[in-house]
């Protein structure tokens, strides 16, 4: 906190410029008018102040705007954005995508900070939904952004925004999140032809139900093992050996290397050993010949 002292004669700042780096902290406090600072915030971003001097400038803005900064100031905060607390940011009303981009640029290359998370939350809530432009921007800065949202938050993503999603944006998503995103992706890409559709839908398939996997198996898609291993176990279990063979195409040989891992392990346990043998991969653990398989879940449903 800088003591309140009168500004020395001739030192009153008429504009925000480089000469202010020669001001002591108390002189900045006494000689820089907060309203002038607010209107010329863009200039602050071109002046090599020390962190201590920036603290004084932030203090002046805080005094001028106790209820929260206007967007005209927020857009030009630059480094000062990193000095804001989430409580400060919750007072803001940020509506411009340009403002959001400018602030995300300051934090570029760093992990998503509490300030950034709060800013994004305020921005998205203000817009009412995650539109395509916003999603484009956020995933460009933070590829993992989408997977940081809860399934409830993801439900506000319109299908049209799914076009902005890149495969790497989904790397850290869990099955609950993909369950929400997959139907939106299916809707977004529904008018594409077979091979193009598969390329687009592939990274969302961790949320696909059995019937969609069965349908894909009829389309010669040649799903790779990495994608197969991310499928929902409950969606894979009902697939027949023939369907999995068609789904994977030439990649079916990779099942052998994954036979101890889910969902392959659990799927093998559900298949007749005879059928598994037809693949010629030496997969073991299927149901021996002559055994009858009872679907107990069906029996419970009937009783």
């Amino acid at each position: 906190e800088v003591e309140k002292t009168a500004c020395p004669s001739g030192k009153k700042a008429r504009e925000i410029d480089e000469s202010l780096i020669f001001y002591k902290k108390w002189e900045l406090e006494a000689c820089v008018d907060a309203a002038l600072l607010a209107t010329q915030m863009d200039r602050v971003n071109a002046i090599p102040f020390t962190y201590e001097q920036l603290d004084v400038l932030k203090h002046k803005l805080d005094e001028l705007y106790p209820q929260g900064y206007p967007e005209s100031v927020i857009q030009h905060l630059g480094y000062l954005f990193l000095k804001m607390s989430p409580e400060d940011i919750r007072k803001w009303n940020v509506t411009s995508l340009e403002t959001l981009k400018a602030l995300l640029e300051v934090n570029k290359g760093h992990e998503m900070s509490p300030q950034v998370a709060t800013l994004i939350d305020r921005f998205v809530k203000g817009r009412g939904q995650l539109d395509k432009d916003t999603l484009d921007t956020l995933t460009a800065f933070y590829p993992g952004y989408l997977c940081s949202l809860s399934p409830e938050e993801l439900s506000s993503v319109p299908p049209s925004s799914i076009w902005a999603v890149r495969p790497q944006d989904l790397d850290t998503c869990d099955p609950r999140q993909l369950d929400v995103l997959y139907p939106k992706a299916r809707l977004a890409f529904q008018n594409m032809n077979g091979s193009e559709y598969f390329v687009k839908i592939q990274s969302f398939l961790g949320g696909a139900p059995t019937e969609d996997l069965k349908a894909l198996s009829q389309q010669n898609v040649s799903m790779d093992l990495a994608t197969f291993m991310k499928l929902r176990t409950d969606a894979v279990l009902p697939l027949t050996v023939a369907e999995v063979q068609k789904l994977l195409g030439p990649h079916v040989e990779g099942l052998k290397a994954e036979e101890r891992h889910r969902p392959v392990r659990d799927w093998i346990l559900r298949q007749r050993q005879d059928d598994l043998d037809t693949l010629g991969l030496g997969l073991q653990g299927g149901i021996p010949n002559g055994y009858l398989v009872l679907d107990l879940s069906m029996q419970e449903a009937l009783s």
Partner: nanobody
Framework: QLQLVESGGGLVQPGGSLRLSCAAS????????IGWFRQAPGKEREGVSS????????NYADSVKGRFTVSRDNAKHTVYLQMNSLKPEDTAVYYC??????????MGQGTSVTVS
């Protein structure tokens, strides 16, 4: 936070000269405006000089005008502070601070200058 690295400090006799350097660690300084600051023992840090990202604009504190010269070599990604006619009152730790695109900031840990 982005780091700057100062070097070139040392012990010098009154009337002598030193050239301080400011370089970036892990990024390039070329589009950064740079300010030189100093802090004497028990005193507040004060501005000494500044130079724009292009090198076209320079500024100096009254106490060093005519004695200190700030310059930059963008090919070497370095900013210099040439200090001539040094006085005992120039004894301090000298720091550089920078501001780049979007108001990104960087600052160094300082290099010590003793005039005695």
């Amino acid at each position: 936070q982005l780091q700057l690295v100062e070097s070139g400090g040392g012990l010098v006799q009154p009337g002598g000269s030193l050239r301080l350097s400011c370089a970036a660690s892990g990024f390039t300084l070329d589009n950064y405006a740079i300010g030189w600051f100093r802090q004497a023992p028990g005193k507040e840090r004060e501005g000494v000089s500044s130079i724009s990202s292009s090198g076209g604009s320079t500024n100096y504190a009254d106490s060093v005008k005519g004695r200190f010269t700030v310059s930059r070599d963008n090919a070497k990604h370095t900013v210099y502070l040439q200090m001539n006619s040094l006085k005992p009152e120039d004894t301090a730790v000298y720091y550089c601070a920078g501001v780049g695109d979007y108001g990104r900031r960087a600052m160094g840990q300082g290099t010590s200058v003793t005039v005695s």
